[in-house]
Interface confidence: medium
């Protein structure tokens, strides 16, 4: 007769491992007992269990409650056992020793491999600001057995670097994603992808990029100076900028306080019916946590009467 087993049994952490051992004997041969032991190199054999033809399954105290026979129906020549709830420490060499009559003893070894699926974590780097050089955007760490694979999925241009730390029964892999921050990256997804034989599908953790910036400020509303004349209603100045985080706006007048009746509404400065008092230099001050910008414009409110007088003068002068 001969023993049938597997060279390697692979199981995911927490699952049950079937340790196969089947005696393919000649007719009339009987199995007296099947002894299972852990036989890692450099250590003495540690008994798991014994399948006895008379006593049935007897489990070593060290493995009490963790070793069972596979569910029926069972072949009397089958010495396979189930190791319940495999843990990382179970990884190693196991030996099945079959005592048969009249053929004698047979033994076979197998290796139990316990896959420890990783639990990845993503850590964002320092705050990203436009104008920085190459900066850490995020790092992704996954520890498992065997070592997991850590990659990045993104449309953002950047560079990656990985390092691995080996522990006694597992390995931790850390991958870093570096980029040169620009405002176009704002809101873009950066996804860490972890692959491992113990995972049914890749694990993905997505980080949304936030790049701090503040665009130059500009003021709209003075495109047609002729519209800024005494008596005009609804005149307004609008401050244009954009940023991350969204900026706040503040209006001041350089050559004095804001005239009465002028309304500040965020990025907009609204005027009452225009008078010459509204002429002056107005400053839009834009700021966020990252930076601040100023833009100033000169408002010159025209007096239509003066203008018509001048025209007459000009005509008469000609």
């Amino acid at each position: 007769g001969e023993l049938e087993t597997s060279d390697v049994v692979t199981v995911v952490l927490g699952q049950d491992a079937k340790l196969p051992c089947f005696y393919r004997g000649d007719s009339g041969e009987q199995v007296g007992q099947v002894a299972w032991a852990r036989v890692d190199a450099g250590e003495g054999a540690q008994e798991l269990a014994l399948l006895h033809s008379k006593y049935g399954l007897h489990v070593s105290p060290a493995y009490e409650g963790r070793v069972e026979q596979p569910p029926p129906p069972r072949n009397p020549l089958d010495g396979s056992v189930l190791l319940r709830n495999a843990v990382q420490a179970d990884e190693g060499e196991y030996e099945c020793r079959v005592s048969t009559f009249p053929a004698g003893s047979f033994q076979a070894r197998l290796r139990l491999r316990v896959l420890v699926p990783p639990l990845p974590s993503l850590n964002p780097g320092p705050a990203l600001e436009e104008g920085q050089g190459l900066t850490l955007a995020a790092s992704c760490t996954a520890e498992g057995s065997p070592a997991p694979s850590v990659t990045w999925d993104t449309e953002v241009k950047g560079t990656t670097s990985s390092r691995s730390f080996k522990h006694s029964r597992s390995a931790a892999v850390t991958s870093e994603f570096h980029l040169v921050p620009s405002r176009s990256m704002n809101g873009q997804p950066l996804t860490c992808v972890v692959s491992h034989p113990g995972l049914l599908q890749d694990q993905r953790i997505t980080h949304i990029l936030h790049v701090s910036f503040l665009a130059e400020a500009s003021v709209r509303g003075l495109e047609d100076q002729n519209l800024w004349h005494i008596g005009r209603e609804g005149a307004m100045l609008k401050c244009l900028s954009e940023g991350q985080p969204p900026p706040s706006y503040n209006w001041t007048r350089l050559d004095g306080p804001l005239p009465s009746g002028v309304r500040v509404d965020g990025d907009t400065l609204g005027f009452p019916p225009l008078t010459t008092e509204h002429s002056g230099i107005y400053v839009c001050h834009v700021s966020n946590e990252f930076s601040s910008r100023d833009s100033q414009v000169t408002v010159d409110v025209l007096d239509p009467q003066e203008d018509s007088g001048k025209q007459v003068d000009l005509v008469s002068a000609s």
Epitope: G32, Q33, A35, G44, A45, E47, L50, H52, K54, Y55, H58, V59, S60, P61, E64, R97, S99, T100, F101, G104, S105
Partner: antibody, heavy 119, light 107 residues
Framework: EVQLVESGGGLVQPGGSLRLSCAAS????????MSWIRQAPGKGLEWVSG????????GYADSVKGRFTISRDNSKNTLYLQMNSLRAEDTAVYYC????????????WGQGTLVTVSS | DIQMTQSPSSLSASVGDRVTITCQAS??????LNWYQQKPGKVPKLLIY???TLQSGVPSRFSGSGSGTDFTLTISSLQPEDFATYYC?????????FGGGTKVEIK
């Protein structure tokens, strides 16, 4: 039929030595855990020593540690107990017994051999 | 080492009586407990293993129970051939240890 036959007992003076043997037949001796158990006259059972199938695991009772040595020869289907520095309190019937492993019951016993330590 | 304490050390009973022998372990041994019967001048014979499993060929009037530290051997209806000494033994760890024995005598 399983048979365990002890031999080697006898009268010995305190401080002397004896070697007990246990010849096994009717089962695959090389697969079984073997033990020596003794019983002093009119007293209870005391496990003396045990040895695993491949001699990889050996245990002794505190009362004999350092004086007794258990061994086996699987090619001869024989278990041994070398007893040195014998004392009067070692006087007993010595049984050999087999079990599938140390955590299984002692299912087969020999008839025993009497060791008497006396001056 | 694990100490095994058996009680009583002896008892007198009549044929047909129900007899109970207890065995206490000095620490938790789960169900790694065996019971043996020994008659005068004879070799010990295994009665019960794993605390409650009857060895094949042993009459069903013998039963065992318990787990952890406290165990019981019960003979439901004592027969003439049951007068003997009974020993408990733990197989949880080496050194293997026996109880002191309980001698069951005829009243």
């Amino acid at each position: 039929e399983v048979q365990l036959v002890e031999s080697g007992g006898g009268l010995v003076q305190p401080g002397g030595s004896l070697r007990l043997s246990c010849a096994a037949s009717g089962f695959t001796f090389s697969d079984y855990y073997m033990s020596w158990i003794r019983q002093a006259p009119g007293k209870g059972l005391e496990w003396v020593s045990g040895i695993s199938w491949n001699s990889g695991s050996i245990g002794y009772a505190d009362s004999v540690k350092g004086r007794f040595t258990i061994s086996r020869d699987n090619s001869k289907n024989t278990l041994y107990l070398q007893m040195n520095s014998l004392r009067a309190e070692d006087t007993a019937v010595y049984y050999c017994a087999s079990s599938g492993s140390w955590y299984l019951p002692l299912d087969y016993w020999g008839q025993g051999t009497l060791v008497t330590v006396s001056s | 080492d694990i100490q095994m304490t058996q009680s009583p050390s002896s008892l007198s009973a009549s044929v047909g009586d129900r007899v109970t022998i207890t065995c206490q372990a000095s620490q938790d041994i789960s169900n790694y407990l065996n019971w043996y019967q020994q008659k005068p001048g004879k070799v010990p014979k295994l009665l019960i293993y794993a605390a409650s499993t009857l060895q094949s060929g042993v009459p069903s009037r013998f039963s065992g129970s318990g787990s952890g530290t406290d165990f019981t051997l019960t003979i439901s209806s004592l027969q003439p051939e049951d007068f003997a000494t009974y020993y408990c033994q733990q197989s949880y760890s080496t050194p293997l240890t026996f109880g002191g024995g309980t001698k069951v005598e005829i009243k």
